[in-house]
Structure formats: structure tokens, C-alpha cells
């Protein structure tokens, strides 16, 4: 956050731990950047909805690290 350079707000305003991994169709990991100072994880569910997931969730940590290490913005 800067008083000179503004920072866009994140899109994930509330995150959840309670998602069954089997219901996830696609996982998008957005690294911290100008659009948001925190890593954001958005799951596209098989029912068509999108849900914000907690990057600190144990079942996500390894997946997120792998994606970020590979340099992909989305996966």
C-alpha cells in the first residue's frame, strides 16, 4: 500500500477453506503484483461458479508453490 502509488484492491475479498478438491475444475493462481499485494487463488468449480480459496490452506500450499515456481500466472 502506498500513499503515492495507489494499489488496486484484490478481487478476493473473502476466502474459504471449505471446498472439496473434487469439485474444482480449474485453479487460477494470481501472484502478488500491482493489481493485488497478495497471492490470490480462484477455483472454477464444475458447477460453473468461481470461489476464492485461502492460499494458506494446507491442500493448496504445494500446488500454489509449484505454479508460482514454474512462472505461470495462471494454471
Amino acid at each position: 500500500v502506498s500513499a503515492v502509488l495507489t494499489e488496486l484492491r484484490c478481487t478476493c475479498l473473502r476466502v474459504t477453506l471449505r471446498v472439496n478438491p473434487k469439485t474444482i475444475g480449474k485453479l487460477q493462481v494470481f501472484p502478488a503484483g500491482p493489481q493485488c499485494s497478495k497471492v490470490e487463488v480462484v477455483a472454477s468449480l464444475k458447477n460453473g461458479k468461481q470461489v476464492c480459496l485461502d492460499p494458506e490452506a494446507p491442500f493448496l500450499k504445494k500446488v500454489i508453490q509449484k505454479i508460482l515456481d514454474s512462472g505461470n500466472k495462471k494454471n
Partner: antibody
Framework: QVQLVQSGAEVKKPGASVKVSCKAS????????IHWVRQAPGQGLEWMGN????????NYNEKFKSRVTMTRDTSTSTVYMELSSLRSEDTAVYYC???????????????????WGQGTLVTVSS | EIVLTQSPATLSLSPGERATLSCRAS??????LHWYQQKPGQAPRLLIY???RSVSGIPARFSGSGSGTDFTLTISSLEPEDFAVYYC?????????FGGGTKVEIK
């Protein structure tokens, strides 16, 4: 009853710290962000920062970043704002306010602050 | 940071008249602009959120419009209890910023 109740007035000496509490009741605590806004006597509103009770992550105004800490206790639905190294210019009424409600869906449409605490007067004087 | 400029600083009107308050942002803030009313000794009260959306319990005489950088709060017919200070505030980006306020006073 849906409300935010803040702790009482404080008088502090320059250089000291103050910790103001804001207790939420009557709504789902983790669905809303909590902001801290201050108002010096006769002046306008100044945003200090906010915290997500859901994740615990905080965002601070650069002006206060080195002196302010915002925390939350989900077991008591209470948010705290601590301001250190106080100076006379910090004399103001400090408000907490909630913003939301937010779901788990990503969005760039944001709510205004629809519920405010009664305010806590912090006076800094030697 | 984004600057919100409110005009006029003071608006002198009589009960029953229409009030038009302006808020201009230094850069686009989408529609994430909100209007607050504050009376002496009280906390601010949200009137309009997301530029034009109404808030439960707020009289229908309060309405908002605009987009991008130029926004307007309109009070269709002033009631005695409407004389107060009005602030616009944006939360599209951090830091959140409020305008300097417009005081609506009795003429």
C-alpha cells in the same frame, strides 16, 4: 442488535501508544471488512487502514504504516487498532466501520461502510 | 494517491430546495464511490454506495449518479434534518480516500 461498540476515550502523552477496540455484534463477523477512520477536531475523514476478519490480512495507509497495527480476535468478534509513537497531531476521534457483506466470489464491486462505531476520542497531550 | 475534490465547499439552501453535490476523482475509480452524511458529534452515515445504489433506511430523496471520475449526489427536496456535511469516499484503490466535504447549510 447490529452494532460496533468501541472502547472509551483515552488521554495519552506524546511518544506513548494507544490501543482502541471495536466489538462487532449482530452480524456474521467474517463477511465484512473493518476499517479505521480518524477525524481530527474540525477536520475531515482520514482513512488509516483496514483488516479482513476473514483472513486477518490488513492494509495500511502509508502515512501510518510504521506506527499502526490492526488485529482481530474472531472468538470475541473484536478488532483492535494500535497506534504508537503518538504526537499531538494524532488527537482525533477514531472510528471503526464495517464494509460488506462479501461472499467467496471474486469481485471488483465494493461496498461502502454501512455501520460505524460511536467513535473513540484519543487526546495526546503532555 | 487518488484525490477526491468536492464542490461546492458550502451550499446554502432552503428546505424544499434541490441540492446537487459534486465529487471529482483525479483518476478513474470505476463506480466504487460512496456518499456519507455526518452531523456534529455523530459518526458518518452511509447514504449511497457504488455510485448509485440505495441503502436500506435512507430516504428516497437521496440519489447518486456518475461514473469514472465525475459523481453527483442529489437531494431532491431538502428536509430540515438534511442540513449536514456530506463526504464522498472511494475504495477502488488503496489508500481509501475521502473528499474534503460539502457543508449543506440553511439559507
Amino acid at each position: 442488535q447490529v452494532q460496533l461498540v468501541q472502547s472509551g476515550a483515552e488521554v495519552k502523552k506524546p511518544g506513548a501508544s494507544v490501543k482502541v477496540s471495536c466489538k462487532a455484534s449482530g452480524y456474521e463477523f467474517t463477511s465484512y471488512w473493518i476499517h479505521w477512520v480518524r477525524q481530527a477536531p474540525g477536520q475531515g475523514l482520514e482513512w488509516m487502514g483496514n483488516i479482513s476478519p476473514n483472513s486477518g490480512s490488513a492494509n495500511y495507509n502509508e502515512k501510518f504504516k510504521s506506527r499502526v497495527t490492526m488485529t482481530r480476535d474472531t472468538s470475541t468478534s473484536t478488532v483492535y487498532m494500535e497506534l504508537s509513537s503518538l504526537r499531538s497531531e494524532d488527537t482525533a476521534v477514531y472510528y471503526c466501520a464495517r464494509e460488506g457483506p462479501y461472499s467467496y466470489y471474486p469481485s471488483r464491486q465494493y461496498y461502502g461502510s454501512d455501520l460505524w462505531g460511536q467513535g473513540t476520542l484519543v487526546t495526546v497531550s503532555s | 494517491e487518488i484525490v477526491l475534490t468536492q464542490s461546492p465547499a458550502t451550499l446554502s439552501l432552503s428546505p424544499g430546495e434541490r441540492a446537487t453535490l459534486s465529487c471529482r476523482a483525479s483518476q478513474s475509480i470505476s463506480n466504487n464511490l460512496h456518499w456519507y452524511q455526518q452531523k456534529p458529534g455523530q459518526a458518518p452515515r452511509l447514504l449511497i454506495y457504488y455510485t448509485s445504489r440505495s441503502v436500506s433506511g435512507i430516504p428516497a430523496r437521496f440519489s447518486g449518479s456518475g461514473s469514472g471520475t465525475d459523481f453527483t449526489l442529489t437531494i431532491s427536496s431538502l428536509e430540515p434534518e438534511d442540513f449536514a456535511v456530506y463526504y464522498c469516499g472511494q475504495n477502488n484503490e488503496w489508500p481509501e480516500v475521502f473528499g474534503g466535504g460539502t457543508k449543506v447549510e440553511i439559507k
